[in-house]
């Protein structure tokens, strides 16, 4: 047909971080380059329908299916999605063709389906059929990186058996301790699988895919560094490969490496060695104990030994199931204002965790660092002097952990009125709890000195705000102090603050606040 | 067996740049466990080094030669490189390529560069 | 002029014993291994020791090499004929971060 237009579907997927849901849009967000979705002709349907391909999406992912049409003339159009009418804007691009959008922000589970576009221009009426589908991420998996030797040579493979395939790199690092952060320059990385070079300070090999990232470190020993405090040590669950480096410089090439496990030398063909020379002929030798796959008995203290330099042990630990160490009991904390703290999780830990921070119902992400002694810690920092309850979550792939932490803000009340027919009320936040008294002002006393003990009903911690306690007291009217001006004050360690309440009639009052330090 | 083959010209006018080259065969000149160097000969003189490159690319020279010498390595072509500058008829000698380790295991024939007008 | 220093001429008969001195320093022999090389007339140097005393395979023992603080000594037993031929020590100098040839010896057998 002669008549029918140029059209073009393609998927836009877009990196951004909005939280609303489906909308027909024509602004433009951060994206990545668009995917042509093919929009072929749908044959024997009853008017003329374009298939777009089959678009696949992640859970919260956020894209925009965009159809251009190159047609002369205006052209109008409706979007349709279980059978509901969606609004379409149709604008024009430079080179004049109709661009018609759909956004769908955070894709969950109900904007998944078949959107359905009818385009009216001046020639014809067509359709369009684009269906979206949530990608089943539940088949995904990452899983952590290990080493292999290269057969026949002297080489390590780094293996991610992850779905989908993952990219796998190579995380290399010649210098000391902060110097191998991530970002730092003194960090190379190499994406690929093999690795030759494996003289370096710090190797690490990493793989990604959808679900993130996981790395695994080369456990080393450097007999040329001063000894750790503690002995290292190594966990690994049965049948995972075991590798520990050993690495030794020296001024020139006399000398020689050994491991022994418990005072035993490793068999041969569980361990390999390789040397270089660094400059001014200093030789760096480095040998390798390895296991396949290790199993009870592999568990013990591997020493690597030198004809030149101190000899240095790890202890391997071979468990059959992941763990994590750590005391679960709730801490609480009360600190001032502007006070700088971070609550902080010590824990010992196999395999590595993945861990979030949360505050009201917000989730933060955790940094772990591993101390010297074989324990990690994680640190959150960022609780803005926010009071309330927050909690700290890890997980392996075999346990899980929970910690509480109350954080308590000292600080002097601030008191909030209310009134009733009945009653009336004031609420107070400061840290200490507060505690309450009420005056009653009359000519008697017009400096409110009278006090109210009578019909008084205190609550302490009546309402939880995000583990935030609220302090209230409350006052039964009575014909006593009915028509008089009453003040409630809420007092603690850092000062007073006290509400004046008109009992007259309920509603809204204008409320004198006084704060007393 | 690993073989050492210097090769370049055998002629160099004074104040030009000699440039020799060496081609390892047999072996991988990104072996671990080795340096490379070069070495001269004088006529109807002693050995003397000139300078050796280590698998991380870090060289070290001859004092005396310092300013004029520059050692490099090609690794997928599996040579090694000897550029000498301003070169005068004191650097006429057979310069030979050797592989270094515990000792000079393997060394090429050596060739002949003359420096003259 | 070498800061290692050999004797440019040693002499001996057939059969005789002979040695070979190699002089240097603290920074240099002193602390450093030392390696002896015989070059054939118009032929590339050729390793006969290394490590101060190790002969490599295929070298006969009536070589043999020592070393006793900043001096070094290559010592051939049964001289031949063919033991004609320049030999020269070599080593690490640690201060000048450079290696170091002695300046030669030419070996006669009388």
């Known amino acids: 047909n002669q008549d029918l237009p140029v059209i073009k579907c393609v998927l836009i997927n877009h990196k951004n971080n909005d939280s609303s849901v489906g909308k027909s849009s024509s602004y433009p967000m951060v994206s990545e380059s668009p995917e042509d979705l093919g929009c072929a002709l749908r044959p024997q349907s009853s008017g003329t329908v374009y298939e777009a391909a089959a678009v696949e999406v992640d859970v919260s992912a956020s894209i925009t299916l965009q159809v251009l049409v190159d047609a002369p003339g205006n052209i109008s159009c409706l979007w349709v999605f279980k059978h509901s009418s969606l609004n379409c804007q149709p604008h024009f691009d430079l080179q004049n063709r109709g661009v018609v959008s759909m956004v769908i922000l955070k894709m969950t589970e109900t904007q998944a389906g078949e959107y359905l576009l009818f385009i009216q221009s001046e020639a014809t009426n067509y359709t369009i059929l684009f269906t979206v589908s949530i990608r089943n991420t539940l088949l995904y998996t990452l899983r952590r990186p290990y080493f292999r030797k290269m057969e026949n040579q002297d080489a390590l493979v780094c293996i991610s058996e992850s779905v989908p395939e993952p990219i796998v790199e190579w995380v290399l690092c010649d210098s000391q301790g902060e110097s191998c952060k991530e970002e730092s320059p003194a960090v190379v990385k190499k994406e690929e699988k093999v690795l030759h070079e494996l003289f370096g300070t710090d190797i690490r090999c990493c793989a990604r895919n959808e679900l993130g990232r996981e790395c695994t470190r080369l456990f080393t020993i450097d007999l040329n560094q001063t000894p750790q405090t503690t002995l290292p040590q190594l966990f690994l669950k049965v049948g995972e490969p075991l590798w520990i480096r050993c690495k030794a410089v020296h001024v020139n090439h006399g000398f020689g490496l050994t491991w022994e496990l418990e005072n035993k030398a490793l068999e041969e063909g569980n361990y390999f060695e390789m040397s270089t020379y660094s400059t001014n002929r200093t030789m760096i030798r480095i040998l390798f104990a390895f296991v396949s796959s290790v199993a009870r008995n592999d568990t013990g203290y591997y020493t690597c030994s030198s004809s030149k330099h101190p000899s240095q042990s790890a202890l391997v630990t071979i468990v059959e199931k992941g763990f994590i160490n750590a005391t679960n009991s709730s801490e609480d904390y009360e600190i001032d204002q502007y006070e700088e703290f971070c609550f902080s999780v010590r824990f010992k830990a196999y395999p590595q965790i993945r861990c979030t921070w949360t505050f009201s119902r917000k989730s933060f992400p955790c940094e772990q660092k591993g101390l010297d002694n074989g324990y990690s810690i994680s640190k959150f920092c960022n609780h803005k002097h926010q009071p309330g309850e927050y909690i700290f979550h890890a997980e392996n792939d075999d346990a899980q952990f929970t910690k509480m932490f109350t954080l308590n803000i000292r600080r002097k009340p601030q008191v909030l009125a209310e009134a009733s027919a009945s009653q009336a009320s004031c609420f107070s936040d400061g840290y200490p709890l507060p505690s309450w008294t009420w005056k009653k002002c009359s000519d008697k006393s017009p400096n409110c000195t009278e006090e109210i003990t009578e019909g008084v009903w205190n609550r302490k911690a009546n309402r939880k705000v995000f583990g935030q306690w609220v302090s209230s007291s409350t006052l039964n009217m009575s014909e006593a102090i009915k028509g008089f001006l009453v003040k409630c004050c809420a007092y603690n360690s850092l000062g007073t603050s006290c509400e004046t309440i008109l009992l007259n009639s309920p509603g809204p009052f204008p409320f004198i606040q006084d704060n007393i330090s | 067996q690993v073989q050492l083959q210097e090769s370049g010209p055998g002629l160099v006018k004074p104040s030009q740049t000699l440039s020799l080259t060496c081609t390892v065969s047999?072996?991988?000149?990104?072996?671990?466990?080795?340096?490379w160097s070069w070495v001269r000969q004088s006529p109807g003189k002693g050995l003397e080094w000139i300078g050796e490159?280590?698998?991380?690319?870090?060289?070290n020279y001859n004092p005396s030669l310092k300013s004029r010498v520059t050692i490099s390595v090609d690794k997928p072509k599996n040579q090694l490189s000897l550029k000498l500058g301003s070169v005068t008829a004191a650097d006429t000698a057979v310069y030979y390529c050797?592989?270094?380790?515990?000792?000079?295991?393997?060394w090429g024939q050596g060739t002949l560069v003359t420096v003259s007008s | 002029q070498s800061v290692v220093t050999q004797p440019p001429s040693v002499s001996a008969a057939p059969g005789q014993k002979v040695t070979i001195s190699c002089s240097g320093s603290?920074?240099?022999?002193?602390?450093?291994?030392v390696s002896w090389y015989q070059q054939l007339p118009g032929t590339a140097p050729k390793v006969l020791i290394y490590?101060?005393?190790v002969r490599p395979s295929g070298i006969p023992d009536r070589f043999s090499g020592s070393k006793s603080g900043t001096s070094a000594t290559l010592g051939i037993t049964g001289l031949q004929t063919g033991d004609e031929a320049d030999y020269y020590c070599?080593?690490?100098?640690?201060?000048?971060?450079?290696?170091?040839f002695g300046g030669g010896t030419q070996l006669i057998v009388l």
């Open positions: 603290n920074s240099n022999i002193g602390n450093n291994y």
């Open positions: 490590d101060n005393n």
């Open positions: 047999g072996g991988s000149i990104s072996s671990s466990g080795y340096y």
């Open positions: 070599e080593t690490w100098d640690s201060s000048l971060n450079v290696g170091m």
């Open positions: 490159i280590y698998q991380s690319g870090n060289t």
């Open positions: 050797a592989r270094g380790g515990s000792y000079y295991d393997y």
